[in-house]
């Protein structure tokens, strides 16, 4: 790597992947292993993110870009830049302090993450329940009872929805 020649800041010519080494008369030196600089003119290289434990490497660190992590199988990312991983549950469950628990009656979760949500209350929209809800699926609302032809009958509406249960903190 050449000595920088800028009249202003001799470090400004140091490209990404290098740092301006004050110990070597401001020569542009390559970033040491497990470090990077994503912009030019850096006086230090940043240490790479290490993906271990619950994290796995999605993109390896290079001299010009940081590593990127995601979560190991059975977990999903939370927070900016996957700052945390959370255990997956099955559909029809939610994660509590004591692990994955089935959704309470009247609630559902159609994903591996998040909380159980109350079934839709069809009657609020003046509709009837066409398909009953389950732990994994919301109810399906159909036409309002008035729209049904004589002799037709709808499925009995579910019990009033309750909030999802959570274990004590």
């Amino acid at each position: 790597f050449e000595r920088t020649r800028s009249l202003q800041d001799p470090c400004s010519n140091c490209p990404a992947g290098t740092f301006c080494d004050n110990n070597r008369n401001q020569i542009c030196s390559p970033c040491p292993p497990n470090s990077f600089s994503s912009a030019g003119g850096q006086r230090t290289c940043d240490i790479c993110r290490q993906c271990k434990g619950v994290f796995r490497t999605r993109k390896e660190c290079s001299s010009t870009s940081n590593a990127e992590c995601d979560c190991t199988p059975g977990f999903h990312c939370l927070g900016a830049g996957c700052s945390m991983c959370e255990q997956d549950c099955k559909q029809g469950q939610e994660l509590t302090k004591k692990g994955c628990k089935d959704c309470c009656f009247g609630t559902f979760n159609d994903q591996k993450r998040g909380i159980c949500r109350p079934w839709t209350n069809c009657s609020l929209d003046g509709k009837s329940v066409l398909v009953n809800g389950t732990k994994e699926r919301d109810v399906v609302c159909g036409p309002s009872p008035a729209d049904l032809s004589p002799g037709a009958s709808s499925v009995t509406p579910p019990a009033p929805a309750r909030e999802p249960g959570h274990s004590p903190q």
């Epitope: 497990n34 230090t44 940043d46 240490i47 790479c48 993110r49 290490q50 271990k52 434990g53 619950v54 994290f55 977990f75 927070g79 900016a80 830049g81 700052s83 945390m84 991983c85 959370e86 255990q87």
Partner: antibody, heavy 119, light 106 residues
Amino acid sequence: QVQLVQSGGGLVQPGGSLRLSCAASGFTFTNFWMDWVRQAPGKGLEWVADINKDGGEKYYVDSVKGRFTISRDNAGNSLYLQMNSLRAEDTAVYYCARDAMRGGDLDYWGQGTLVTVSS
Amino acid sequence: AIQMTQSPSSLSASVGDRVTITCRASQSISSYLNWYQQKPGKAPKLLIYAASSLQSGVPSRFSGSGSGTDFTLTISSLQPEDFATYYCQQSYSTPTFGQGTKVEIK
């Protein structure tokens, strides 16, 4: 409840060896990475090593590389730290700890065991 | 390695006081910052993970904030059992701890 019970500390001469053990109970041991952290007398905490679920991946702080070996026995729910070529500066209380498998935090710790390296 | 610098190194406070401890990383560590409490002769205890998440069973008077390089642990109303040493730890790369902050009785 989660418990980590340590054993194996003691007095050893410089250059000597010692093996620390950590018996885990109250959780599924094979689901967690495990760590060793040490604390020299009157000083702060220093991370030493960690090991993945099946024992195939291991990481060490630079000052112990080549001298210490972390290992685990998943059948026996136990974690180990084999310490060779011990130096005076390795004198510390050693803690085993469980990685919470969340964000790199250590949510349960053993009671600690004192290792003294002295002639 | 990433350096973690805590301040102050010690402080004196009274029961009921609001106490703030800061931790600065030598480079950005996003939110990969954890806080521990340690009492003499005991193992550390996890208080806060991922910068601001309260560990289960920890009283709500403890809170954490910050991201990037600057982080804070706050005890909203100091209790007698809170006199201890507090450590920050980064889990962004090879783990490192701050040097500790000792909270003493005034």
